[in-house]
């Protein structure tokens, strides 16, 4: 940055190089150039010469004043007009930053996604600070009192192998930047209570033309957790409101869920699960689309039909790549 230049003098900022956004600030420039009594001192912000609010303090020093400075970053430098010099002479430069102290981190959440081998902790950092803000995640065993700290700039993944102080911990987050420091409340966790089962995935759907047509959704998870509660939500793509069905699930085999749906309508399905009685849900699965056939199904694609046991016809949808869920962060 501009701070690496060779200086023939000194530039400084009051109250500080990093300051609260919206403050009034003063930038001082003091020349120390051999054989030069500056006729004039000039200030530049991001390469553009400033015209106003410049005060000459003495023969070698001038001040530039800004009211209500709102730019997150700016490069400042100052120059001198020296007698017998055709060009301005560079005195010095400085990068300045404005921003806010951190808010108190809240909504601290830690979960273990099954098979990940990590505990993932996230939090709400609050308003944008505009300046470099670091977070220290503290994890303290309620059994051994041992504490581990992890420095990060956003969320953190902590290897569960490193959590050797038993099952019960306190977790809290400390936020710090040049303008201040804040700390969250302490979250008490038990490692067995924060496991989120392996993702549930909808693999295919078929509509069977029985007396009353029904749609079967096939879905599965690789979870080894025995007691799992799931929700499947579905709606016509033209609707705003979701319908939700709840299931107590045993994933020793592929799940089949039956729905009686309107004909000739495109539906979207999502599923999510949690360990029964625990706090955290999976994010909703990827969107799965399925269009129900007309009342008397029209055979439109060989790929999506085959004979079924009730002599009806089947219209099927198969999961390939799906759009990502609009609620992937919904774990509360």
């Amino acid at each position: 940055g501009i701070t690496n230049i060779n200086c023939s003098g000194h530039i400084w900022v009051e109250p500080a190089t990093i300051f609260k956004m919206g403050m009034n600030i003063s930038i001082y420039c003091q020349a120390a150039i051999k054989n030069c009594q500056p006729r004039k001192l000039h200030f530049y912000k991001n390469g553009i010469k400033e015209r106003f609010q410049i005060t000459r303090i003495n023969k070698t020093t001038a001040r530039l004043w800004y009211k209500n400075f709102l730019e997150p970053h700016a490069s400042m430098y100052c120059t001198a007009e020296c007698p017998k010099h055709f060009q301005e002479t560079l005195i010095c430069g400085k990068d300045i930053s404005s921003g806010y102290p951190p808010d108190i981190p809240d909504e601290v959440t830690c979960v273990i996604y099954e098979y990940s081998g990590n505990m993932t902790c996230t939090w709400n950092a609050g308003k944008l600070t505009y300046i470099d803000t670091k977070y220290v995640v503290h994890v303290k065993s309620l059994e051994t009192e041992e504490e581990q700290q992890y420095l990060t700039s956003s969320y953190i993944n902590i290897s569960t192998d490193s959590l050797q102080g038993g099952k019960k911990y306190l977790v809290w987050v400390q936020a710090a930047n040049a303008l201040g420091m804040e700390e969250s409340k302490q979250l008490q966790i038990h490692l067995d209570d924060i496991v989120i089962p392996s993702a549930a995935v909808i693999s295919r759907a078929e509509t069977i033309n029985a007396t009353v047509p029904k749609t079967i959704i096939y879905w599965d998870s690789q979870t080894t957790i025995e007691k799992v509660s799931c929700e499947m939500r579905y709606k016509a793509t033209t609707n705003q409101t979701w319908n939700v069905k709840e299931f107590d699930t045993n994933f020793t085999y592929v799940q089949q869920s039956e729905f009686y749906l309107e004909p000739n309508i495109k539906y979207v399905f999502q599923v999510r699960c949690q360990e029964t009685g625990k706090r955290y849900w999976q994010p909703w699965s990827s969107l799965f689309f399925h269009k129900t056939p007309e009342t008397v199904p029209q055979v439109t694609s060989k790929a999506f039909q085959h004979d079924t046991w009730n002599s009806g016809l089947t219209v099927a949808s198969i999961s390939t790549g799906h759009l990502t869920s609009d609620n992937r962060g919904d774990i509360g």
């Epitope: 051994t144 009192e145 420095l151």
Partner: antibody, heavy 121, light 112 residues
Framework: QVQLQESGPGLVKPSETLSLTCTVS?????????MCWIRQPPGKGLEWIGC?????????YYANWAKGRVTISVDTSKNQFSLKLSSVTAADTAVYYC????????????WGQGTLVTVSS | DIQMTQSPSSLSASVGDRVTITCQAS??????LAWYQQKPGKAPKLLIY???KLAAGVPSRFSGSGSGTDFTLTISSLQPEDFATYYC??????????????FGQGTKVEIK
């Protein structure tokens, strides 16, 4: 045998900076640990000054009465910890202790014997 | 700011007496509390940590109890070497920007 040894001048002039070093031997420090400084003014109770956490990063914590005046630092290669307290007054006259458990707990199994620092002109 | 309030500030007791000292935290500190014994001219000595765990080499007449905000140190049968000053210390967290002191004010146990 665990030993914590505080060292530094016993007399400091008002407005100057008090500087103490704690040299630790006999402790196999864990990967994460706390080292703390505590003081005790004559005839009074224990006063926490601050701690340094040493792990994958270094973090310092100070009592709010000492903020802006105190700096705690570590030289891990020498197992030495230092305390600097600036702008001292007569109220900073005390026995200064360093203390640790050699791990990342905040109770102290091991203490130095303490060193008396007098602030006087 | 977590504040530690210890009581009484002093007490007189005889050898063989059961002595109880209490410590109250201004907020929940779980079981993160330690007790120390200090004799004149000496550094403090750890007696109890995690509210109720006896430190190595400490006689079993010393015991600690409590969690959350209220804690107790009990000496079941006071011995001549137990006359000293006792301090509680919260060991929950020091990262809070507003901590003034982590120790209680101390309780001096004197001979009656």
């Amino acid at each position: 045998q665990v030993q914590l040894q505080e060292s530094g001048p016993g007399l400091v002039k008002p407005s100057e900076t008090l500087s103490l070093t704690c040299t630790v031997s006999g402790i196999d420090f864990n990967s994460n640990y706390y080292m703390c400084w505590i003081r005790q003014p004559p005839g009074k109770g224990l006063e926490w000054i601050g701690c340094i956490y040493v792990g994958s990063h270094v973090n310092t914590y100070y009592a709010n009465w000492a903020k802006g005046r105190v700096t705690i630092s570590v030289d891990t290669s020498k197992n030495q910890f230092s305390l600097k307290l600036s702008s001292v007054t007569a109220a900073d006259t005390a026995v200064y202790y360093c203390a640790t458990s050699g791990s990342s707990v905040l109770y102290f199994k091991f203490w130095g014997q303490g060193t008396l620092v007098t602030v006087s002109s | 700011d977590i504040q530690m309030t210890q009581s009484p500030s002093s007490l007189s007791a005889s050898v063989g007496d059961r002595v109880t000292i209490t410590c109250q935290a201004s907020e929940n500190i779980y079981s993160f509390l330690a007790w120390y014994q200090q004799k004149p001219g000496k550094a403090p000595k750890l007696l109890i940590y995690s509210a109720s765990k006896l430190a190595a080499g400490v006689p079993s007449r010393f015991s600690g109890s409590g969690s959350g905000t209220d804690f107790t140190l009990t000496i079941s049968s006071l011995q001549p070497e137990d006359f000293a000053t006792y301090y509680c210390q919260q060991t929950n967290r020091y990262s809070n920007p507003d901590i003034y002191n982590v120790f209680g004010q101390g309780t001096k146990v004197e001979i009656k």
